[in-house]
């Protein structure tokens, strides 16, 4: 089920996913001057079975110099600037994809792709927060947010993170001191919660991450 809202914005912090749950969609966006090939995929989709998850479909871009029948979807510079306020500069990816069942790693780049990636998350997805450069993290609890669904409405849990203006940077899970245990998470406040989170399995995996080069936008 798609998350129909956005992860919370924390002042002076950015967030990213370590891996993507099955059902996650990634827009096939092309950089300026290029467009999706005719009849090309609109999205990549994280799919899988019990033993393996991978991205279905391939994004392909071609020069707009050829006949363009698709409206340009690459953001304008000013729009791009606005949208980069909640994105991650360098999304992490698992070294061993199989270590997190039901999740996909960061897809490899495709030729002439846009400078940012637009993901559509599903219920159960977790994103991790860190303070931007020049700010220090004060943790009151886990610095992550999970998309949950209650009464048919989706919401993201509030990350317990405050970023203060001191010249010291925090790191993502696996690069910092241990934080609150999974049991320390606030539970759902209602009885009709129809999804569970995968906090434990994702935090176990967090130490196996390495960075890649993409700027990412989460929808």
């Amino acid at each position: 089920e798609l998350c129909d809202d956005d992860p919370p914005e924390i002042p002076h912090a950015t967030f990213k996913a370590m891996a993507y749950k099955e059902g996650t969609m990634l827009n096939c966006e092309c950089k300026r001057g290029f467009r999706r090939i005719k009849s090309g995929s609109l999205y990549m989709l994280c799919t899988g079975n019990s033993s393996h998850s991978s991205w279905d479909n391939q994004c392909q871009c071609t020069s707009s110099a050829t006949r363009n029948t698709t409206k340009q979807v690459t953001p304008q510079p000013e729009e791009q600037k606005e949208r980069k306020t909640t994105e991650m500069q360098s999304p992490m990816q698992p070294v061993d994809q199989a270590s997190l069942p039901g999740h996909c790693r960061e897809p490899p780049p495709w030729e002439n792709e846009a400078t940012e990636r637009i993901y559509h998350f599903v219920v159960g997805q977790m994103v991790y927060y860190q303070c931007v450069q020049g700010y220090r993290a004060l943790h009151r609890g886990p610095a992550e947010s999970v998309c949950k669904m209650t009464h048919g409405k989706t919401r993201w849990t509030q990350p317990q993170l405050i970023c203060t203006g001191e010249m010291e940077t925090s790191q993502f899970p696996g690069e910092e001191k241990p934080q609150a245990s999974p049991e320390g998470r606030p539970e759902s406040e209602t009885s009709c919660l129809v999804t569970t989170t995968d906090f434990q399995i994702q935090t176990e995996m967090a130490a196996t991450m390495e960075t890649s080069i993409f700027t990412t936008e989460y929808q």
Epitope: E1, L2, D4, D5, G23, R83, V122, G152
Partner: antibody, heavy 116, light 106 residues
Framework: QVQLVQSGAEVKKPGSSVKVSCKAS????????MHWVRQAPGQGLEWIGY????????EYNQKFKDKATITADESTNTAYMELSSLRSEDTAVYYC?????????WGQGTLVTVSS | DIQMTQSPSTLSASVGDRVTITCSAS?????MHWYQQKPGKAPKLLIY???NLASGVPARFSGSGSGTEFTLTISSLQPDDFATYYC?????????FGQGTKVEVK
């Protein structure tokens, strides 16, 4: 209470454009995506797309990518959908619906009739 | 795109009848949602996440299913239930609806 109030019925000539509005009240407008759905006469429901009012980001059903443009005005808590290059087959009732999951609140609908 | 196929398209029934509407998705989805629509009115949320009744919906309505096959059941049809019913998936874009099932008076 949550309310979505849409603009009134429109009759348009082929080739022209129309802009339908949806004014939200009773909740924080920027906290929910606003979706648009169309229903041609005697037909079913078709999802057109949504807007995130806070950032202006839109996502469209590819079928309507070149037909609809969704915008929002945070200052007036109003979402808009403009339909361009109207043809007779665009005659339909257009609904806005509050997102954030299932569509729990809908506008009353705006009938757009395209006729020469 | 995920295609949603409802059956039947039209259902003739009488007050007190047990009515069942099915919805098949072309690919497996997480949940099904159901809306009720009356002529000249906007759709109204009936059932969310396959089996949960929306606020104010009578207990005679129920939903079930998983994967690609889902069902909406009205245990004892009431006069107010004559309407068109739509299934809806929001597991993937584009969001899609079934073509609708009209429940009419026999």
């Amino acid at each position: 209470q949550v309310q979505l109030v849409q603009s009134g019925a429109e009759v348009k000539k082929p080739g022209s454009s129309v802009k339908v509005s949806c004014k939200a009240s009773g909740y924080t407008f920027t906290s929910y995506r606003m979706h648009w759905v169309r229903q041609a006469p005697g037909q079913g429901l078709e999802w057109i797309g949504y807007i995130r009012p806070k950032k202006g980001y839109t996502e469209y059903n590819q079928k309507f990518k070149d037909k609809a443009t969704i915008t929002a005005d945070e200052s007036t808590n109003t979402a808009y959908m403009e339909l361009s290059s109207l043809r007779s087959e665009d005659t339909a009732v257009y609904y806005c619906a509050r997102g954030g999951g299932v569509f729990d609140y809908w506008g009353q609908g705006t009938l757009v009739t395209v006729s020469s | 795109d995920i295609q949603m196929t409802q059956s039947p398209s039209t259902l003739s029934a009488s007050v007190g009848d047990r009515v069942t509407i099915t919805c098949s998705a072309s690919s497996s989805i997480s949940y099904m949602h159901w809306y009720q629509q009356k002529p000249g009115k906007a759709p109204k949320l009936l059932i969310y996440t396959t089996s949960n009744l929306a606020s104010g919906v009578p207990a005679r309505f129920s939903g079930s299913g998983s994967g690609t096959e889902f069902t909406l059941t009205i245990s004892s049809l009431q006069p107010d239930d004559f309407a068109t019913y739509y299934c809806h998936q929001r597991s993937t874009y584009p969001l899609t609806f079934g073509q609708g099932t009209k429940v009419e008076v026999k």
